[in-house]
């Protein structure tokens, strides 16, 4: 019986182990600045790294310009986006600025698109000094299914930070569906 | 057999216990406010609490201003930096501020310092009012390895916020490395 | 054997499932814009979804304006809170405001109330521009026992945006306490 | 990497006029309260003036009152020296810092209190 004994606690380390890691997903995207669209309306962000510097995926997918989710659970979501510009860039088009996020969740089997998650703000940027800067960050808990879809959208995209520290996104899920 | 499989369940019980405190450090640090360096350029922050207030620490180290992390894994790192002057703590040099935040990872074994996440907005604190008050917040999720540390760099010191509820950064444990 | 084997693996899998269910509270709010006070003044926002839309709970309760606490554990708590201002919304009494939010913790046995986050900005928000918005995030990582209390206090609530992806507030429990 | 760059020094007469100014260039500061300070052959460095972020504010050496003024443009660089009524013993190397701290201290005529120094230009009254 206690050879049994090890033989359950064996298997059951690996199944915990096993399990633990198949039920926590988890993404963080940074941007992808070779393809930031121009503009100053609304736009979705499509291009994002998932595999280099901080950039990370795990039992989810990054396909389309969208982040898919895998496993049905509840996540935590997070964006960090800033937005900046020096006068070397060229002359804004309006000093009256809205710099603002959206992060969207699209159910394919339902097309439809809402946003779970919105910030930022409106800004004067004066000519009176060379440089601008402002960022915005925004998280919550949600439920997600498989198959349903996170992107981000953004307001003046040609505004934004490209580095990997500033621009980025990402989930992890904390906990299943009951 | 009965007796046996409530040993089982016992111990397993213990060992989830166990393994799942073991497997979850996390750390909530408060600016202490007695050591804030002077300057407008940016500075690393080596002064905070750990164990009073809201603060507090485990299964990580605090160590020259450093949080240090003991365990591989994912982690959620977090911080929030309140800026704040009014007319009565004296005159400010510039009224044009940038007010920034950077949660930087250094790696003890390649001596080197990377930044994971930036935030923070460009400030016009024009003497028209006489109070002024800004505050940041960053969030992300990050692949951290035993002995890796995370600090936090500021511009303009001077004027954060020393409240505990204001100025704090932290982490928790998420999930293991694969 | 072989059968007493499955049965313990059996429970097992349906001890850790509950167990885990069990300890993960959460709470996901968003405002009840309907009875959103007046004035400029700092105030306590009492009305909250908890069961519609991006709305959640569970093993947690949401009572009189306060969200409680039914579990000890470290909790991570957020909050969003997004204010705007159209001029076809009438003349700002000031167009210096100070946006601010304050997420506060209140123990019933010592009824004492302190404030763990608070975030927020000095904004002008002038005549020349007919349309203002702004955003505040704060999130970290408290312990919190079970019967206590955390509510949402914000500057000019008169000036919130009450859409459920710009206001809100929440919480998940990430670990048990020692 | 930041650099200050002085320029407008010459040779001019006594009593007569220059005007100098400090430009940054690389990660600029040109919305950062700045200082000029001097130093004549085999001298200390001497300060000669300093200007708020916004120009609102300035503040002058005694030996310089009255007949030295700073100013920044409204829009960012540079941040210019008016010098008037020049002396001999106004003959130096001008250079202009970066001030270093959020807020105006008493120091603010220390050179230790200033960053980011230029090469300098060299000013010469003489007849």
């Known amino acids: 019986i206690r050879a049994e004994k090890a033989m359950v606690d064996g298997s059951w380390l690996d199944l915990a182990k096993r399990s633990k890691l198949e039920a926590q997903p988890f993404a963080h995207l940074t941007i992808n600045a070779t393809d930031i669209p121009s503009g100053s309306h609304k736009v979705s962000l499509s291009s994002w790294y998932h595999d280099r510097g901080w950039a990370k995926i795990s039992n989810m997918t990054f396909s389309n310009g969208k982040l898919i989710v895998n496993q049905d659970g509840f996540y935590y979501l997070y964006a960090n986006i800033c937005f900046r510009h020096h006068e070397t860039s060229g002359d804004l088009a309006t000093e009256y600025l809205q710099l603002m996020v959206y992060v969207t969740k699209t159910s394919i089997k339902i097309p439809s698109s809402h946003t779970l998650m919105k910030g930022g703000s409106t800004k004067y940027w004066s000519g009176n000094s060379e440089f601008h800067f402002y960022s915005i960050n925004v998280g919550g808990f949600f439920k997600l299914r498989s198959g349903e879809e996170i992107s981000i959208e953004v307001s003046n995209p040609s505004l934004l930070d490209p580095d990997q520290d500033a621009t980025y996104f990402g989930a992890f899920k904390v906990r299943d569906i009951d | 057999i009965r007796a046996e499989k409530a040993m089982v369940d016992g111990s397993w019980l213990d060992l989830a216990k166990r393994s799942k405190l073991e497997a979850q450090p996390f750390a909530h640090l408060t600016i202490n406010a007695t050591d804030i360096p002077s300057g407008s350029h940016k500075v690393s922050l080596s002064s905070w609490y750990h164990d009073r207030g809201w603060a507090k620490i485990s299964n990580m180290t605090f160590s020259n201003g450093k949080l240090i992390v003991n365990q591989d894994g994912f982690y959620y790192l977090y911080a929030n930096i309140c800026f704040r002057h009014h007319e009565t703590s004296g005159d400010l040099a510039t009224e044009y501020l940038q007010l920034m935040v950077y949660v930087t990872k250094t790696s003890i074994k390649i001596p080197s310092s990377h930044t994971l996440m930036k935030g923070g907005s460009t400030k016009y604190w024009s003497g028209n009012s006489e109070f002024h008050f800004y505050s940041i917040n960053v969030g992300g999720f990050f692949k951290l390895r035993s002995g890796e540390e995370i600090s936090i760099e500021v511009s303009n010191p001077s004027l954060l916020d020393p409240d505990q509820d204001a100025t704090y950064f932290g982490a928790f444990k998420v999930r293991d490395i694969d | 054997i072989r059968a007493e084997k499955a049965m313990v693996d059996g429970s097992w899998l349906d001890l850790a499932k509950r167990s885990k269910l069990e300890a993960q509270p959460f709470a996901h709010l968003t405002i009840n814009a309907t009875d959103i006070p007046s004035g400029s003044h700092k105030v306590s926002l009492s009305s909250w979804y908890h069961d519609r839309g991006w709305a959640k709970i569970s093993n947690m309760t949401f009572s009189n304006g306060k969200l409680i606490v039914n579990q000890d554990g470290f909790y991570y708590l957020y909050a969003n809170i997004c204010f705007r201002h159209h001029e076809t919304s009438g003349d700002l009494a000031t167009e210096y405001l100070q946006l601010m939010v304050y997420v506060t913790k209140t123990s019933i046995k010592i009824p004492s109330s302190h404030t763990l986050m608070k975030g927020g900005s000095t904004k002008y928000w002038s005549g020349n521009s007919e349309f203002h918005f702004y955003s505040i995030n704060v999130g970290g990582f408290f312990k919190l026992r079970s019967g206590e209390e955390i509510s949402i206090e914000v500057s000019n609530p008169s000036l919130l945006d009450p859409d459920q992806d710009a206001t809100y507030f929440g919480a998940f429990k990430v670990r048990d306490i020692d | 990497e930041v650099q200050l760059v002085e320029s407008g020094g010459g040779l001019v007469q006594p009593g007569g006029s220059l005007r100098l100014s400090c430009a940054a260039s690389?990660?600029?500061?040109?919305?950062?309260?700045m200082g000029w300070f001097r130093q004549a052959p085999g001298k200390g460095r001497e300060f000669v003036g300093f200007?708020?972020?916004?120009?609102?504010?300035?503040y002058y050496g005694e030996s310089v009152k009255g007949r030295f003024t700073i100013s920044r443009d409204n829009a960012q660089n540079p941040v210019y020296l008016q010098m008037n009524s020049l002396r001999p013993e106004d003959t130096a190397v001008y250079y202009c810092?970066?001030?270093?701290?959020?807020?105006?201290?008493?120091?603010?005529?220390?050179?230790?209190?200033?960053?980011?120094w230029g090469q300098g230009t060299l000013v010469t009254v003489s007849s």
């Open positions: 810092g970066v001030y270093r701290r959020t807020y105006i201290s008493s120091t603010y005529s220390e050179s230790s209190e200033y960053d980011y």
């Open positions: 200007i708020t972020g916004s120009g609102g504010t300035t």
């Open positions: 690389g990660r600029t500061f040109s919305r950062s309260a």
